[in-house]
Interface confidence: medium
């Protein structure tokens, strides 16, 4: 009995920022849950975590250096990623687990979202660029 997740197939981050909405076939209201966003085909990098507990404030954090925020809807979590680098263009997967009330639930693997980062390169440009080659 798995939760189904829907994501946009592709998003373009024009200004190094993007909103990725994860829509679930499950109502998160009054649940203890952990929603996370993972980078790469193997989901090796946990980009951002949104932890919700019916008795506490929503916790949003990244242990991998991403600048992220999260917003909770009844059946969705939206991850807001900022300061993305062009080389962070990749496929991103939404995951969810519900710990309370029982039974423990998690999701079927989603199709993922390709985030294409087209923004500025976020690296300092030289003040005095060298002479251009003819």
């Amino acid at each position: 009995n798995k939760i189904l997740v829907k994501q946009s197939p592709m998003l373009v981050a024009y200004d190094n920022a993007v909103n990725l909405s994860c829509k679930y076939s499950y109502n998160l209201f009054s649940r203890e849950f952990r929603a996370s966003l993972h980078k790469g085909l193997d989901s090796a990098v946990e980009v951002c975590v949104v932890y919700g507990n019916y008795s506490q404030q929503l916790q949003v954090y990244s242990k991998t250096g991403f600048n992220c925020d999260g917003k909770l809807g009844n059946e969705s979590v939206t991850f807001y990623l900022q300061n993305l680098y062009v080389n962070q263009t990749d496929i991103y997967f939404c995951k969810i687990e519900v710990m309370y009330p029982p039974p423990y639930l998690d999701n079927e693997k989603s199709n993922g979202t390709i985030i294409h980062v087209k923004g500025k390169h976020l690296c300092p440009s030289p003040l005095f660029p060298g002479p251009s080659k003819p």
């Epitope: 952990r34 996370s36 932890y51 995951k95 687990e97 710990m99 309370y100 009330p101 029982p102 039974p103 423990y104 998690d106």
Partner: nanobody, 118 residues
Framework: VQLVESGGGLVQPGGSLRLSCAAS????????IGWVRRAPGKEEELVAR????????RYADSVKGRFTISADTSKNTAYLQMNSLRAEDTAVYYC????????????WGQGTTVTVSS
Amino acid sequence: VQLVESGGGLVQPGGSLRLSCAASGFNIKDTCIGWVRRAPGKEEELVARICGEYGSTRYADSVKGRFTISADTSKNTAYLQMNSLRAEDTAVYYCAAQPRYYDVYDYWGQGTTVTVSS
């Protein structure tokens, strides 16, 4: 379904113990595993809990920073590392599958006794 605890014993205050909970008949990554302790004259306490494939954890305030719960899904075993033990940690520690806060559980182990005394 079976849960078998081990690792209890007598330890001096400030010492450490590591409890193990070997599960069979179900996959621990498909549920939550909790460590519950019972001591005479005290309320039963869910001291730590770990859930699912991603290993989300939660601790009772009384053990935060001292106890660490973990799981090895390849061995289908959960662990409770107990450091800086105190006399008040003396209890029978039970491993329970799918804790339903705070006092009802689906499956229980037989318990292992932890005694903290000099």
